[in-house]
């Protein structure tokens, strides 16, 4: 992957040797190179000092004067619009030395009828209109151009596509006399791709369509269509891949059933069923034909659509996703959790883990959280000792010129990383939890006790005393 070399003095663990890729054709930029240290073995410290000085002087060039901003471009084709008819658009930061393009789909729930779309327009207009969008945005997490923050793809061309269609990126209907709102999520993606071809995407080697939450589901719904679009436009050599963060939901039974009144309380199956009709939603063709007419909502659920996808997709999902819990009517209010709810939450983690068993490229930490890839600290969480950027790097390597066919995992470079411990925050690298009312940070032990876990029953399967377990959790081990 494109990442700055990390220099270590002797005595520290050396990095794995860089993997040399096939030499690029003449005129193509070189994105990685092997280093041979044999000639400087005797005087490594002085050599390192020179390299460090060189790196520091060159760094501003590669980081393009450290300007982190992505610049807004409204679509030239103004018929492809946000909900209110204003033109959709994208934020772009080019990296001319790179043939990698990252297109990120923003998330932000959805609305599925006139009433809750009106309410959304009043309270969250930015998610329905481009009228007040800022001229620039800062790239964070996987969209950052800083190697420290984004060791995975810091040098890629970065594109942030704001979510202003409220349709989980699936809609294909324009605003008219009859339709108060336009729902053009699927068309926005197609148009952005079309316009980016004229801005350098035509020379891409890899296009990674990424997204978080509703944007993560949007990846699953659109990644194959983008690949098909590029093929039809005469760019079959661009490898299209997907990265779906926090968009792999379950159509499970709610903890407490509520009527479909608003976006949050409506069971996801019912919300999507209504939404598809309202948005004129489109789903991947290969998935659609597996279900009867009117049952296309099934294709919004990762475990049902994933087996029908042709592009390689990496799935990132917290085992205890806050958005999933919200639609399941689980609200952790600060009161200690009763046993029935605790068992429900544990079972949710188990079910989610089960749906990922046949997903070779996945990263699923046992944490209570939502979204990760554009958080600045997205590098912190680990599953079985591997961070997400490292797992993505391994995924890139496993796909190198082989697409989805590669079956053998690379030694020491895992891509299937799903936590097996059974309760929220049993992974000590989980993001810190805050008490919903006091805002104070809770350590894992406090959180588990707050969740109503009896330390005795938690410690026993680990062969530990409760005091030992508490110590380990408090130390973050």
């Amino acid at each position: 992957s494109e990442g700055r070399k990390t220099w270590r003095r002797r005595g520290q663990q050396p990095p794995p040797p860089p993997r040399t890729e096939a030499a690029p054709a003449a005129g193509q930029p070189v994105e990685s190179f092997p280093l041979d240290f044999t000639a400087v073995e005797g005087n490594m410290d002085s050599f390192m000092a020179q390299v460090k000085s060189l790196a520091q002087s060159l760094y501003p060039c590669s980081a393009q004067q450290l300007n982190e901003d992505l610049r807004l471009h409204l679509l030239l084709n103004t018929s492809v619009t946000c909900n209110d008819g204003s033109p959709a658009g994208y934020y772009l930061k080019e990296s001319r030395g790179s043939r990698r393009w990252l297109l990120f789909l923003e998330g932000g729930w959805y609305c599925f009828n006139r009433e809750n779309c009106d309410s959304r327009y009043d309270t969250m207009r930015r998610l329905m209109s481009s009228r007040d969008w800022p001229r620039t945005r800062t790239g964070t997490g996987i969209l950052s151009s800083q190697p420290e923050e984004n060791p995975y793809w810091w040098n890629a061309n970065m594109v942030f596509i704001p979510y202003c269609s409220s349709d989980v990126w699936s809609g294909a209907s324009s605003k008219s006399e009859k339709n108060e709102y336009a729902f053009m999520g699927a068309l926005i993606i197609q148009e952005v791709v079309r316009e980016l071809l004229g801005r350098g995407l035509s020379g891409a080697k890899v296009l990674l369509l990424a997204g978080s939450s509703a944007g993560g589901t949007g990846v699953l719904l659109n990644v194959d269509r983008v690949a098909e679009q590029l093929e039809k436009l005469g760019y079959p050599a661009i490898q299209v891949r997907g990265l779906a963060d926090s968009g792999w939901f379950l159509d499970n039974k709610q903890y407490r059933h509520t009527d479909c009144v608003d976006t949050i309380t409506c069971a996801p199956t019912e919300a999507i069923r209504r939404g598809i009709r309202y948005w004129n939603g489109v789903v991947p063709e290969r998935c659609r034909r597996q279900f009867q007419e009117g049952e296309e909502w099934n294709c919004f659920f990762g475990y049902k659509v994933y087996p029908t996808l042709r592009c390689p997709v990496f799935v990132v999902q917290w085992l205890f996703d806050e958005a999933q819990l919200t639609v399941d009517n689980v609200h952790l209010t600060g009161q200690p959790v009763q046993e029935g709810l605790r068992l429900y939450i544990q079972n949710l983690g188990r079910e989610l883990r089960h749906t990922l068993k046949d997903v070779p490229a996945s990263f699923a930490p046992a944490c209570l959280s939502h979204e990760i890839i554009i958080r600045s600290h997205w590098t912190d969480v680990q599953v079985k000792g591997t961070s997400l950027p490292r797992a993505l790097h391994c995924w890139d390597r496993s796909l190198h010129d082989s697409h989805k066919a590669s079956k053998t995992p690379l030694k020491g470079c895992p891509v299937h990383l799903v936590d097996s411990c059974p309760w929220p925050h049993c992974n000590p690298s989980c993001p810190t939890v805050r008490d919903q009312f006091t805002g104070q940070e809770m350590n894992v032990a406090q959180f588990l006790m707050h969740m109503g876990f009896d330390m005795q029953t938690v410690a026993q399967p680990q062969g530990l005393e409760p005091s030992e377990l508490l110590g380990m959790l408090s130390n973050g081990s």
Epitope: P236, R286, R288, R289, Q290, F291, Q292, E293, E295, P307, T308, L309, R310, H403, K404, A405, K407
Partner: antibody, heavy 119, light 107 residues
């Protein structure tokens, strides 16, 4: 275990139609597609069409005007009908199951219905 | 339509040999290719799907490789029960199409 059983006539007059029923067991038609493939010495294996689990169909354009496929989920049956038969439609006709997947291949086949078109 | 050209059309080998059958697609089909075995008087049986994945119950002496337009089926340590005709099939686009077959016999 997974089985596809075919029933249909062996001999049909030219210009008449062929009807074959494929009755499946060991899986549900609401979860799997069923394809139709024929095999003749002159043309080898030819794909004719498919009935998807959702109830939609796809046909080989070369046969679309005279082919129809339907099904009854409750009876676990898929029906194949081809009109205006000619001598070169003489072949073995197979139904075959297609898994829920990202491309079409056939993991289980029926034993075939041998058809001769002759007056 | 995508044409699938299989070669050789017939092949004679000895027991214990390793043989290779190739299949060439007229356009890029990625890895969307399957291999079938058909014994005389029987229906085709799936051996390999997605270019290299062995179907359940198929002996490990069968293997598949390739992507794009060129694919191979390899049978190592040839056994008497491998006498059959072998077909490739593309699943990239409709209409689905098959190779003309390779008839394998034992010397």
């Amino acid at each position: 275990q997974v089985q596809l059983k075919q029933s249909g006539p062996g001999l049909v007059q030219p210009s008449q139609s062929l009807s074959i029923t494929c009755t499946v067991s060991g899986f549900s038609l609401t979860n799997y597609g069923v394809h139709w493939v024929r095999q003749s010495p002159g043309k080898g294996l030819e794909w004719l069409g498919v009935m998807w689990s959702g109830g939609s169909t796809d046909y080989n354009v070369a046969f679309i005007s005279r082919l129809s496929i339907s099904k009854d989920n409750s009876k676990s049956q898929v029906f194949f009908k081809m009109n205006s038969l000619q001598a070169d439609d003489t072949a073995i006709y197979y139904c075959a199951r297609s898994p829920y997947s990202n491309y079409d291949y056939f993991d289980y086949w029926g034993r075939g219905t041998t058809l001769t078109v002759s007056s | 339509d995508i044409q699938m050209n299989q070669s050789p059309s017939s092949l004679s080998a000895s027991l214990g040999d390793t043989i290779t059958i190739t299949c060439h697609a007229s356009q890029n089909i990625n890895v969307w290719l399957s291999w079938y075995q058909q014994k005389p008087g029987n229906f085709p049986k799936l051996l390999i799907f997605k270019a290299s994945n062995l179907h359940t119950g198929v002996p490990s002496r069968f293997s598949g490789s390739g992507s794009g337009t060129g694919f191979t089926l390899t049978i190592s340590n040839l056994q008497p029960e491998d006498i059959a005709t072998y077909y490739c099939q593309q699943g990239q686009s409709y209409p689905l199409t098959f190779g003309g077959g390779t008839q394998l016999e034992i010397k």
